[in-house]
């Protein structure tokens, strides 16, 4: 069984330029970097940083890329067999439940709280009460409330589009 | 011309083949699927078999059912029938971008103790 | 496997009416969707396929539109003959995603 292609994005139909490579489905599937013809019965390679397909597939397009937001840096560029990487800039940061935007990382902890993790391009910065060591889930504290802190350095790709 | 044989009546777990037999056009150049339906519910894809024998199912398919083929041929059996699988089946013919251009009239099978 | 959502699972209009049907998939098939006209004791028969062109036979009361994830069979000048149910169907990556048929349509021409 091949894996599923969960990239939802995808790009209109193509017609084979002659610059596209063909070659024959193997068990009626195409390779990476690949789409299924038409007719079924040649394989047709998708355009480099148009679009792309991850796996062996019957599908009769290739993924479109996606195009990094503005508040992204793109980690690496789109290739025929996988999708662009995409991250938040520096002192922004994407949740799971909210991945549609990067979002900026509060500058510090709410007053009798202590910050345990930096800003990263998937989480907001950690505070924790003094006391107890529990975690803050709040809102963002007024100014005058906050211990200032530096946002941390991005170091691994927040959302793997591919 | 598609045509489906092999329907009847089984008790569960006795193992049945379908067959589904074709003229007019080579079975070595199209792919072909499966499709069943129960008694007054709607259309279910089972799988289908590429034009060089390679067969996929649908994901609560697997197991339940094996599709293969000869030059004229295409067998659906059903592994372990359920009562739950009395349906009608049919066997069509599958083009990649045009669908499922020409159907068989479809054949009864009843599971039933 | 994808999931297609099919509305509305009944509708009624008189002869000369107009039907729409909607189907949405739940991921991108471009405008890879086939829809099929069944009637009782019937097999399905092919109405459209790469979701606007007609198949050979199919008057063109009968009309398929959309792409992506949202698609629609408009049936307009309802005719009794065109009492049935309706379903939609993907056809790109069949062996990729499967091929499930929409819940389907039944149209009840009054």
């Known amino acids: 069984e091949s894996a599923l292609i969960t990239q939802q994005d995808l790009a209109p139909q193509q017609r084979a330029a002659p610059q596209q490579k063909r070659s024959s489905p193997s068990e009626g599937l195409c390779p990476p970097g690949h789409h299924i013809s038409e007719d079924g019965r040649d394989c047709i390679s998708c355009k480099y940083g148009q679009d792309y397909s991850t796996h062996w597939n019957d599908l009769l397009f290739c993924l479109r890329c996606t195009r990094c937001d503005s508040g992204e840096v793109e980690l690496s560029p789109c290739t025929t067999t996988r999708n662009t990487v995409c991250q938040c800039e520096e002192g922004t940061f994407r949740e799971e439940d909210s991945p549609e935007m990067c979002r900026k990382c509060r500058t510090g902890c709410p007053r009798g709280m202590v910050k345990v993790g930096d800003c990263t391009p998937w989480s907001d910065i950690e505070c924790v009460h003094k006391e107890s060591g529990t975690k803050h889930s709040g809102e963002v504290p007024a100014v005058e409330e906050t211990v200032t802190s530096s946002p941390g350095t991005p170091a691994s790709p927040c959302s793997l589009s591919g | 011309s598609v045509e489906e044989s092999g329907g009847r009546l089984v008790t569960p777990g006795t193992p049945l083949t379908l067959t589904c037999t074709v003229s007019g056009f080579s079975i070595s150049r199209y792919a072909m699927i499966w499709v069943r339906q129960a008694p007054g519910e709607g259309l279910e894809y089972i799988g289908f078999i590429t034009s060089d024998s390679s067969a996929y199912y649908a994901s609560w398919a697997k197991g339940r059912f094996t599709i293969s083929k000869t030059s004229t041929t295409v067998d659906l059996k059903m592994t372990s029938p359920t009562t739950e699988d009395t349906a009608t089946y049919f066997c069509a013919r599958y083009t990649y971008s045009d669908g499922t251009d020409l159907w068989g009239p479809g054949t009864l099978v009843t599971v039933s103790s | 496997d994808i999931v297609m959502t099919q509305t509305p699972a009944s509708v009624s209009e008189p002869v000369g009416g107009t039907v729409t049907i909607k189907c949405q998939a739940s991921q991108s098939i471009s405008t890879y969707l086939s829809w099929y006209q069944q009637k009782p004791g019937q097999p399905p028969k092919r109405l459209i396929y790469?979701?606007?062109t007609l198949a050979s036979g199919v008057p063109s009361r009968f009309k398929g539109s959309g792409s992506g994830t949202d698609f629609t069979l408009t049936i307009r000048d309802l005719e009794s003959a065109d009492a049935a149910t309706y379903y939609c169907q993907p056809n790109s990556g069949i062996a990729t995603y499967g091929a499930a048929f929409g819940g389907g349509t039944e149209v009840v021409v009054k």
């Open positions: 790469k979701a606007s």
